[in-house]
């Protein structure tokens, strides 16, 4: 997956830091105070969407072959830049009963991006 460097507008991973204070969660999330969540941004032109390296799945690669040939119903489908690899993160927080919970939360951090 590409890292966004400001030079290309192709689907890439953009760094983004989430501060729990910014969204009002700081009074119940004990740690961390924030984290690099990141997000996906950029274009998914046909020639990119069809390559398995940047594609979300074999399925989207196959569908894209039909889309490029103008086959209905895929002709007007747009390929989107989405997370293809996500990573968990450990969090310490208060649950609904004010008990302290330590949990590895799945899909917290965007590691790589690709075209759907």
């Amino acid at each position: 997956g590409l890292e966004c460097d400001g030079k290309v507008n192709i689907c890439c991973k953009k760094q983004f830091f989430v501060s729990f204070k910014d969204i009002g969660w700081n009074d119940w999330i004990i740690a961390p105070s924030g984290y690099h969540a990141n997000y996906c941004e950029g274009e998914c032109p046909s020639h990119i969407a069809g390559t398995s390296g940047s594609s979300l799945s074999f399925h989207s690669t196959v569908i894209n072959h039909y889309r490029m040939r103008g086959h209905s119903p895929f002709a007007n489908l747009k390929s989107c830049c989405v997370p293809t690899k996500l990573r968990p993160m450990s969090m310490l927080y208060y649950d609904d009963g004010q008990n302290i919970i330590k949990k590895d939360i799945q899909n917290m951090i965007v590691e790589e991006c690709g075209c759907s």
Epitope: G24, N26, D95, D96, I101, K103, N107
Partner: antibody, heavy 123, light 108 residues
Framework: QVQLVQSGAEVKKPGASVKVSCKAS????????MHWVRQAPGQGLEWMGV????????NYAQKFQGRVTMTRDTSISTAYMELSRLRSDDTAVYYC????????????????WGQGTLVTVSS | EIVLTQSPGTLSLSPGERATLSCRAS???????LAWYQQKPGQAPRLLIY???SRAGGIPDRFSGSGSGTDFTLTISRLEPEDFAVYYC?????????FGGGTKVEIK
């Protein structure tokens, strides 16, 4: 300590509207969703809808779609529920209740409730 | 929508007895998203149990919750005078949020 303080009792005529307020204190207001639940005399609890104070996004029960509007003023940590075109069967106690609607963490129970606001609809 | 059916509607028991309240869901509810509330006359509901089996802060250990899938139970091991009230189950896994019809625990 966490407190949800609601506005006082209201008496309304059929066809009118009512706006109930719920002032939050003791916690970070935008960090918790605010739900509204009503209870008709001698009846059970009925969920009306929810507002995310951070974004203003709402989700209403189908029964109340088109008649209910939930808003908030984050500057004064207050949520509002307005019900229009009132009928006699809208006579009930209306509660606000906070929750963190975050399924990934197993969160979402209504841990604090307002004291309730009695709305009487009568001609 | 997920329909929650509570039984019995009324439970007549004496102080010191064991109370068993049932909540059945129309479709499977992950046990992480089932709560029980207690309501006394003229008061707002109070959270007793969340995540089907975890007690909320300040709730005595005579209250316990269990169950999974579609069948959940609230048990009060030994009824105290202050436990006579109405109890509601609620699911918070899906919108619309729904409550059971309630079980009234009254003094026999």
């Amino acid at each position: 300590q966490v407190q949800l303080v609601q506005s006082g009792a209201e008496v309304k005529k059929p066809g009118a509207s009512v706006k109930v307020s719920c002032k939050a204190s003791g916690y970070t207001f935008p960090g918790y969703h605010m739900h509204w639940v009503r209870q008709a005399p001698g009846q059970g609890l009925e969920w009306m809808g929810v507002i995310n104070p951070s974004s203003g996004d709402t989700n209403y029960a189908q029964k109340f779609q088109g008649r209910v509007t939930m808003t908030r003023d984050t500057s004064i940590s207050t949520a509002y529920m307005e019900l229009s075109r009132l009928r006699s069967d809208d006579t009930a106690v209306y509660y606000c209740a906070r929750a963190r609607d975050i399924a990934a963490l197993g969160l979402g129970a209504f841990d604090y409730w307002g004291q309730g606001t009695l709305v009487t609809v009568s001609s | 929508e997920i329909v929650l059916t509570q039984s019995p509607g009324t439970l007549s028991l004496s102080p010191g007895e064991r109370a068993t309240l049932s909540c059945r869901a129309s479709q499977s509810v992950s046990s992480s998203y089932l709560a029980w509330y207690q309501q006394k006359p003229g008061q707002a509901p109070r959270l007793l149990i969340y995540g089907a089996s975890s007690r909320a802060g300040g709730i005595p250990d005579r209250f316990s919750g269990s169950g999974s899938g579609t069948d959940f139970t609230l048990t009060i091991s030994r009824l105290e005078p202050e436990d006579f009230a109405v109890y509601y189950c609620q699911q918070y896994v899906a919108y619309p949020r729904t409550f059971g019809g309630g079980t009234k625990v009254e003094i026999k």
